[in-house]
C-alpha cells in the first residue's frame, strides 16, 4: 500500500523536510503533490511526468519544493504555514490512480527564556515570590530547576499558568537558591540564566561566645556576638541594661568583681526591622588563697604509724582535692578521706608513701594547688646484704666484706664473727686470712629512730680446697628456636677459674654460646634440640679443682611435620588399614586423626579392618604440643579398589 513518511515529523522553522514515498507502484505515468488531504487542482504544488522527466509547478508551488524521480518531495526553508497534510496523486500507465497522504508539523526555534520576579527581596516567613518564565510561547512546555535539580515536592511550591509561573509561598532562608526556567517544544529546548533569590531573614536569637560565664579577677573579658541574619545584623551591647557600644565584640580588660552582671547582645536587621537579644550572666570571682598542707606526724614509722594530712585553710562550701605523685588518689584501703575531703589519712604508712602529696581547693573556675609535701617515713632496716657474694676464700688473701640494709635514717652496722662482736662499721676488713678465719660472719643493722634491728649471717670458708660446684639454670625447659638459657656455676669464689664441658668435651666454638661473668655463666642463645646435652662446670685455683654433676638440658621442640607409615596409598578391598603417625616432639605430641575432615581418634595408630572403596579419601594426622604451643599435620590420600581390579598393595 502506498504510504508517505515525513522525515522529520516535527520540523523547525527554516529547516527542511522530506516527504518520503513507500511502496510506489510499477508502470507509472506520473504523479502530482497537493497541499491538503485531497486532490485539489488549486492546491497543486508540483506534477511530474515520468516519460519526459518533466516537473511542472502548480498554484501552490513556493519555489522551495523539489520533487525526486522516486516521487519523494523535499521542502526547504520551512515556514510556519507549511504545517499540515500533503497528498500524493499517482497516475499509473493503466490510468488507474492511487493516492496517499502524509503530514508534518512546524515549530519555531525557541528563544533563550528569562525569569521575571514579582519580589526581589522577600522577607522570610512573610512574603511569597512568583517567578515567571518569559516569553510566553505557544505550544511550549515550561520546566523549572532549583540548584540545577528538578523541583522538590513541597506544599510551599506551586506551578500555574501552564507551569510558566512558579510561586514560593512563605519563603524561608533555605529558598535562597539558583532558579532557572526552561522552555521546550518538539524541536528545541532552552534554559534561562540563573536567578538567585535573596531572602531577607533574621536576626535569629544571637549566640554569645565563649560560653564560659565564670572569670577570675584580673582576667580580660572578650565576648563575641553572632546572629544569623540577611543582611548581616547590626550589634549592640548592654551591661546590666545600660548601653555600652555598637560592635560585634565587647572587650573589657583586667576585670574585677564589679564587672559581674548581665551582659546583653542585641542584633538588629534594618531590612526586616527585627531585633533579637540574648543575655548571659557573667560572674567574676576574687582570687582564692593558696592552700597548704599540715601533717600530724612528720616522721612516721613504717607499718606502725598513721599520718593525717590536712588541707588548709578551712573554707566553707569548698571542694578539696588530693594528688599523690601527681596522680589522683589511688583506691586503697590504707587511704581514708574525711567527709569534707579536707583530711587525708594514711593508715599504716610504708616507705612507698613518701609522696609527694598535694592538695587543691576547687572554685568555679579552676583548682589552686598547694606546694608538694614529702613524708619522711622511717623504715627498716631490711635484711642486710653482705657483699661480695663469695663464700670460699684461699688462705693468704684479704677478706673485705661490706654490709648494706635499706633503712631511714641510714642504719648503724655491727659485725660479729661466730657470735662475738668485732666492730661497728659498715665494712669488715681482715688481711692475710687463714683457715682459722672460717666461720659465721654476722652483719647487724640497727635503725636508731625506729629501734629495729636485722641481721644476716654468711658462712665463710677459708680453704685451699675448692668445694664441688653445682649448676643453676634460669630456664629448665627452654623452647627450641625461641628461648635462651643461662647456666651459672655456683658458688662464686675468689681467684677462681671457671670451666665448662658439653658431653665431656670442651665448649665448641659457636655464635650461640657465650661466656660471661668471668666465665661463670654460660648462655645458650636460641636453643635447639641438639643442645639437649650434659653440661658440666668446673672450678679451679692454683691449689685444687672440682667438677659439678652433669645437668641435662630439656629442650622443648616440635612437633615436626608428621610422617604417616606405611607410605602405601593404594589398597585392595578387604585388606586391613593400619596407619601409624610419628612426629619428632618434646614432650611427645598429642595425636589425632581425621578422615575426609571428620575427627576420629586421638591415637598414634589408626586401624580399620577389612576396608572397602567406601574408605577412600584423605587421612590427616594432626599433632599438637601444648608446651611449645605449636601444631602440625600431614594429609595422605588412600585409594581402595575392588579386589582384583588394581595392582595396589594390601596391608
Amino acid at each position: 500500500k502506498l504510504t508517505i513518511e515525513s522525515t522529520p515529523f516535527n520540523v523547525a522553522e527554516g529547516k527542511e523536510v522530506l516527504l518520503l514515498v513507500h511502496n510506489l507502484p510499477q508502470h507509472l505515468f506520473g504523479y502530482s503533490w497537493y497541499k491538503g488531504e485531497r486532490v485539489d487542482g488549486n492546491r497543486q504544488i508540483i506534477g511530474y511526468v515520468i516519460g519526459t522527466q518533466q516537473a511542472t509547478p502548480g498554484p501552490a508551488y513556493s519555489g522551495r519544493e523539489i520533487i525526486y524521480p522516486n516521487a519523494s518531495l523535499l521542502i526547504q526553508n520551512i515556514i510556519q504555514n507549511d504545517t499540515g497534510f500533503y497528498t500524493l496523486h499517482v497516475i499509473k500507465s493503466d490510468l488507474v490512480n492511487e493516492e496517499a497522504t502524509g503530514q508534518f508539523r512546524v515549530y519555531p526555534e525557541l528563544p533563550k527564556p528569562s525569569i521575571s520576579s514579582n519580589n526581589s527581596k522577600p522577607v522570610e516567613d512573610k512574603d511569597a515570590v512568583a517567578f515567571t518564565c518569559e516569553p510566553e510561547t505557544q505550544d511550549a512546555t515550561y520546566l523549572w530547576w532549583v540548584n540545577n535539580q528538578s523541583l522538590p515536592v513541597s506544599p510551599r511550591l506551586q506551578l500555574s499558568n501552564g507551569n510558566r509561573t512558579l510561586t514560593l509561598f512563605n519563603v524561608t532562608r533555605n529558598d535562597t537558591a539558583s532558579y532557572k526556567c526552561e522552555t521546550q517544544n518538539p524541536v528545541s529546548a532552552r534554559r534561562s540564566d540563573s536567578v538567585i533569590l535573596n531572602v531577607l531573614y533574621g536576626p535569629d536569637a544571637p549566640t554569645i561566645s565563649p560560653l564560659n560565664t565564670s572569670y577570675r579577677s584580673g582576667e580580660n573579658l572578650n565576648l563575641s556576638c553572632h546572629a544569623a541574619s540577611n543582611p548581616p545584623a547590626q550589634y549592640s551591647w548592654f551591661v546590666n541594661g545600660t548601653f555600652q557600644q555598637s560592635t560585634q565584640e565587647l572587650f573589657i580588660p583586667n576585670i574585677t568583681v564589679n564587672n559581674s552582671g548581665s551582659y546583653t547582645c542585641q542584633a538588629h536587621n534594618s531590612d526586616t526591622g527585627l531585633n533579637r537579644t540574648t543575655v548571659t550572666t557573667i560572674t567574676v570571682y576574687a582570687e582564692p588563697p593558696k592552700p597548704f598542707i599540715t601533717s600530724n606526724n612528720s616522721n612516721p614509722v613504717e607499718d606502725e604509724d598513721a599520718v593525717a594530712l590536712t588541707c588548709e585553710p578551712e573554707i566553707q562550701n569548698t571542694t578539696y582535692l588530693w594528688w599523690v605523685n601527681n596522680q589522683s588518689l589511688p583506691v586503697s584501703p590504707r587511704l581514708q578521706l574525711s567527709n569534707d575531703n579536707r583530711t587525708l589519712t594514711l593508715l599504716s604508712v610504708t616507705r612507698n608513701d613518701v609522696g609527694p602529696y598535694e592538695c587543691g581547693i576547687q572554685n568555679e573556675l579552676s583548682v589552686d594547688h598547694s606546694d608538694p609535701v614529702i613524708l619522711n617515713v622511717l623504715y627498716g632496716p631490711d635484711d642486710p646484704t653482705i657483699s661480695p657474694s663469695y663464700t670460699y676464700y684461699r688462705p693468704g688473701v684479704n677478706l673485705s666484706l661490706s654490709c648494706h640494709a635499706a633503712s631511714n635514717p641510714p642504719a648503724q652496722y655491727s659485725w660479729l664473727i661466730d657470735g662475738n662482736i668485732q666492730q661497728h662499721t659498715q665494712e669488715l676488713f681482715i688481711s692475710n686470712i687463714t683457715e682459722k678465719n672460717s666461720g659465721l660472719y654476722t652483719c647487724q643493722a640497727n635503725n636508731s629512730a625506729s629501734g629495729h634491728s636485722r641481721t644476716t649471717v654468711k658462712t665463710i670458708t677459708v680453704s685451699a680446697e675448692l668445694p664441688k660446684p653445682s649448676i643453676s639454670s634460669n630456664n629448665s625447659k627452654p623452647v627450641e628456636d625461641k628461648d635462651a638459657v643461662a647456666f651459672t656455676c655456683e658458688p662464686e669464689a675468689q681467684n677462681t677459674t671457671y670451666l665448662w664441658w658439653v658431653n665431656g668435651q670442651s665448649l665448641p666454638v659457636s655464635p650461640r654460646l657465650q661466656l660471661s661473668n668471668g666465665n661463670r655463666t654460660l648462655t645458650l642463645f636460641n636453643v635447639t634440640r641438639n643442645d639437649a646435652r650434659a653440661y658440666v662446670c668446673g672450678i679451679q685455683n692454683s691449689v685444687s679443682a672440682n667438677r659439678s654433676d652433669p645437668v641435662t638440658l630439656d629442650v622443648l621442640y616440635g612437633p615436626d611435620t608428621p610422617i604417616i607409615s606405611p607410605p602405601d596409598s593404594s589398597y585392595l578391598s578387604g585388606a586391613n588399614l593400619n596407619l601409624s603417625c610419628h612426629s619428632a616432639s618434646n614432650p611427645s605430641p598429642q595425636y589425632s586423626w581425621r578422615i575426609n575432615g571428620i575427627p576420629q581418634q586421638h591415637t598414634q595408630v589408626l586401624f580399620i579392618a577389612k576396608i572397602t572403596p567406601n574408605n577412600n579419601g584423605t587421612y590427616a594426622c594432626f599433632v599438637s604440643n601444648l608446651a611449645t604451643g605449636r601444631n602440625n599435620s600431614i594429609v595422605k590420600s588412600i585409594t581402595v579398589s575392588a579386589s582384583g581390579t588394581s595392582p595396589g598393595l594390601s596391608a
Epitope: 598414634q604 595408630v605 601444648l626 604451643g629
Partner: antibody
Framework: QVQLVQSGAEVKKPGASVKVSCKAS????????LHWVRQAPGQGLEWIGY????????NYSQKFQGRATMTADTSTSTAYMELSSLRSEDTAVYYC?????????????WGQGTLVTVSS | DIQMTQSPSSLSASVGDRVTITCRAS??????LAWYQQKPGKVPKLLIY???NLVEGVPSRFSGSGSGTDFTLTISSLQPEDVATYYC?????????FGQGTKVEIK
C-alpha cells in the same frame, strides 16, 4: 560403645598379692593405653601406672615401682594389674581407665572399679 | 613429681550461682590439665582436657581456663545434678597426679 569391665571385689591378708582384671570392648584394644588409678575410702585419686597393650611397655609411679605389675592379653582384650606385699593402706577401689589418646592425654573411659580390702 | 593443689576443698552454693574452682601446679604444665567430676558412689567422668577443651556431651555451663601453673574450672550456673567432687589432673608426662578434690554442695 566403649566399656571397661573389671573383676569383682577381693579381700586379702597383709603380705599377700591381688590381681585385678579389666576387660575392654567397643574399641581397638591395642590402640589405646590403659592406666590404673586407685581411690582409698573417702580419699582422692592416686595414679599407679599405665601399660601400652600394643608393645607391653609399662610405666609405674615411683611409689608402686617393684610392687605393681601390669600385663595385657591382646587375644582377650584384657589388662591385668597385680599388686604384691599388700598392706592395710592398700585398701582402696582400683580403677582401670583408658587414655583418651596416646601421649599426654587424660583418662576418658573408666572401669566400674574393684574394691580390694586388705585386712588381717 | 608435679604436685597439684586444688582450692577450695569444699564449697556450698545456691542453684544458679557461678562456681569457680582453682587448681595450681607446682611447675609449668603448659595446658596439659584435665578436670573430672565424681558423683557419690560413681566413677570419675572426664569433663575437660587440655585446660579448656570440653568433652563431647558435657553441658556448656562447664568451662576451663588457664595455662602454665594456674587453672580454673567454672560452672556458670550451678544445677542440682552438679553436686559432686571435682578433681584436676595434669597429663603432662608421667607420673600423672591429681588434685585433692573439691566437694561441691547445694545450699
Amino acid at each position: 560403645q566403649v566399656q571397661l569391665v573389671q573383676s569383682g571385689a577381693e579381700v586379702k591378708k597383709p603380705g599377700a598379692s591381688v590381681k585385678v582384671s579389666c576387660k575392654a570392648s567397643g574399641y581397638i584394644f591395642t590402640s589405646y593405653w590403659l592406666h590404673w588409678v586407685r581411690q582409698a575410702p573417702g580419699q582422692g585419686l592416686e595414679w599407679i601406672g599405665y601399660i601400652n597393650p600394643n608393645t607391653g611397655y609399662t610405666n609405674y609411679s615411683q611409689k608402686f615401682q617393684g610392687r605393681a605389675t601390669m600385663t595385657a592379653d591382646t587375644s582377650t582384650s584384657t589388662a591385668y594389674m597385680e599388686l604384691s606385699s599388700l598392706r592395710s593402706e592398700d585398701t582402696a577401689v582400683y580403677y582401670c581407665a583408658r587414655e583418651y589418646g596416646n601421649y599426654n592425654y587424660p583418662l576418658d573411659y573408666w572401669g566400674q572399679g574393684t574394691l580390694v580390702t586388705v585386712s588381717s | 613429681d608435679i604436685q597439684m593443689t586444688q582450692s577450695p576443698s569444699s564449697l556450698s552454693a545456691s542453684v544458679g550461682d557461678r562456681v569457680t574452682i582453682t587448681c595450681r601446679a607446682s611447675e609449668n604444665i603448659y595446658g596439659y590439665l584435665a578436670w573430672y567430676q565424681q558423683k557419690p558412689g560413681k566413677v570419675p567422668k572426664l569433663l575437660i582436657y587440655n585446660a579448656k577443651n570440653l568433652v563431647e556431651g558435657v553441658p556448656s555451663r562447664f568451662s576451663g581456663s588457664g595455662s602454665g601453673t594456674d587453672f580454673t574450672l567454672t560452672i556458670s550456673s550451678l544445677q542440682p545434678e552438679d553436686v559432686a567432687t571435682y578433681y584436676c589432673q595434669h597429663h603432662y608426662g608421667t607420673p600423672y597426679t591429681f588434685g585433692q578434690g573439691t566437694k561441691v554442695e547445694i545450699k
